[in-house]
Interface confidence: low
């Protein structure tokens, strides 16, 4: 579902996208345009993600710009005022609504904006078990920018003697290059165990661009929690598991 | 050994209000997703909240509103504030680790509410 | 929200009798459904988690198996200790809902 009206009351029932009118060709000068996203459950939250196609005039956001409030209308609390060509972060509100407004002026013009919507998911609902015999994990929204305030856990579960494969096809996290006194990824990262989460031995915990490489579990359980913070936001990964079936003797279980 | 103890159940009025605490032990109660689950007398299971590790909350649509669910980490304990409660809300209140799934239950406080 | 349909609702059956019981999801929950087992005046214990693991310290007797929407927990030797009542649940999304529960009882 795509929208190029000029506003518009978007109540969601499933992901789609708003634009500026006429993207991805020029917007119309001394347009006023707003939109309100509501989600259907008043306990729900809205995450919004901008097309990396980002074009508004760029002169200190005093003449084009976009503007994002947490709330239903202007007197919402500002999220943030935008424009140029580079396309803002994730926005995720604290309630069920978002309120966004786009002003050109009436001269120079870009292609404008295109912006996804869709209901924030988070804990229960970004967390997945896994029992096939091989899959694909990835972080939520990937390729696309992750969300901020994520408690995703993923669980490969696989019959007891058997072997499990874990290997990265993409790994992309905000970095932590100067950690104090020997703690590293303290914004986001991706924690690995085989096992249960705090339970079973820790493999590794990781952020930035050093990929974990090739991971091996064999106690059946392999778990990875991704948590990321209130702010940057990076690509995310993409991981392969299989499942290898153990050689050991059924008579040893 | 992992030990979950409710307590804070009784007799309340209704439109009244309680507090019920579950106690942890045996585990590093920081790591773990806790839930409150409800058992009306002579009925099944009924799912009431959750909350994640970080905070996080979730709610059955019947106590959206009224009821409060939180932690205090420093006393390993999960805590469910029950306002403006109704008779319909006579039940066992059980505290549930969430591991694989509601993996540790404790033996459960009994909420009665009537006039 | 998801409905979860348990039947049957009770079974007599005796010791040493193979036990199973369905639960139906109102629409596919992948292998998001867990078994518990209650006896009277007691809390519940988790049986089979992610459809058909069998959680820690529960006897080999007690199976769990399906996807998506049809679930199965089987007790292929029943004993004298099974006799209580058992509920399947899906995590696979809020609000979490639970079948209404099978009451296994002595034949």
């Known amino acids: 579902f795509r929208n190029d009206k000029c506003g518009d009351t978007i109540k969601i029932e499933s992901p789609g996208y708003l634009t500026s009118p006429g993207y991805p060709h020029s917007y119309h000068p001394s347009e006023k345009c707003e939109w309100l996203i509501q989600a259907p459950d008043p306990y729900q939250r809205i995450m919004i993600n901008f097309n990396p196609h980002f074009d508004l005039e760029d002169r200190d956001c005093k003449y084009d710009y976009v503007e994002v409030f947490d709330g239903e209308n202007e007197n919402g609390h500002f999220r943030g005022k935008f424009c140029g060509k580079i396309a803002p972060p994730p926005v995720v509100s604290s309630g069920p609504f978002l309120f966004i407004k786009f002003v050109s002026d009436y001269e120079t013009h870009g292609a404008g904006f295109s912006i996804r919507y869709e209901i924030f998911k988070r804990g229960p609902e970004c967390s997945q078990n896994y029992t096939t015999p091989s899959g694909v994990i990835k972080s939520p929204g990937f390729p696309e920018k992750y969300p901020n305030s994520l408690e995703c856990t993923y669980i490969v579960f696989v019959p007891k003697m058997s072997e499990i494969i874990l290997e990265f096809e993409s790994f992309d996290l905000e970095p932590d290059s100067n950690p104090p006194g020997g703690m590293f990824c303290r914004y986001d990262r991706l924690e690995i165990w085989d096992g249960f989460p705090d339970v079973g031995p820790h493999i590794g915990r990781y952020c930035g661009q050093k990929t974990p490489g090739r991971i091996r579990s064999s106690s059946g359980i392999l778990s990875m929690v991704f948590y990321t913070d209130s702010a940057i936001a990076k690509e995310g990964f993409s991981a392969n598991y299989s499942v290898l079936q153990s050689s050991v003797s059924e008579d040893f279980k | 050994e992992v030990q979950l103890l409710e307590s804070g159940g009784g007799l309340v009025k209704p439109g009244g209000s309680l507090r019920l605490s579950c106690a942890a032990s045996?585990?590093?109660?920081?790591?773990?997703?806790m839930s409150w689950v409800r058992q009306a007398p002579g009925k099944g299971l009924e799912w009431v909240s959750s909350?994640?590790?970080?905070?996080?909350?979730y709610y059955a649509e019947s106590v959206k509103g009224r009821f409060t669910i939180s932690r205090d980490e420093s006393k390993q304990t999960l805590y469910l504030q029950m306002q403006s409660l109704k008779t319909e809300d006579t039940a066992v209140y059980y505290c549930?680790?969430?591991?694989?799934?509601?993996?540790?239950w404790g033996q459960g406080t009994l909420v009665t509410v009537s006039s | 929200d998801i409905q979860m349909t348990q039947s049957p609702s009770s079974l007599s059956a005796s010791v040493g009798d193979r036990v199973t019981i369905t639960c139906r999801a109102s629409?596919?929950?992948?292998?998001?459904l867990n078994w518990y087992q209650q006896k009277p005046g007691k809390a519940p214990k988790l049986l089979i988690y992610?459809?058909?693991s069998l959680q820690s310290g529960v006897p080999s007797r007690f199976s769990g198996s399906g996807s998506g929407t049809d679930f199965t927990l089987t007790i292929s030797s029943l004993q004298p200790e099974d006799f209580a009542t058992y509920y399947c649940?899906?995590?696979?999304?809020?609000?979490?809902?639970f079948g209404g529960g099978t009451k296994v009882e002595i034949k």
């Open positions: 909350i994640s590790r970080t905070g996080y909350t």
């Open positions: 629409q596919s929950i992948s292998s998001y």
């Open positions: 045996g585990f590093t109660f920081s790591s773990y997703a």
């Open positions: 549930a680790r969430v591991g694989t799934a509601f993996d540790y």
């Open positions: 992610a459809a058909s």
């Open positions: 649940q899906q995590s696979y999304s809020t609000p979490l809902t």
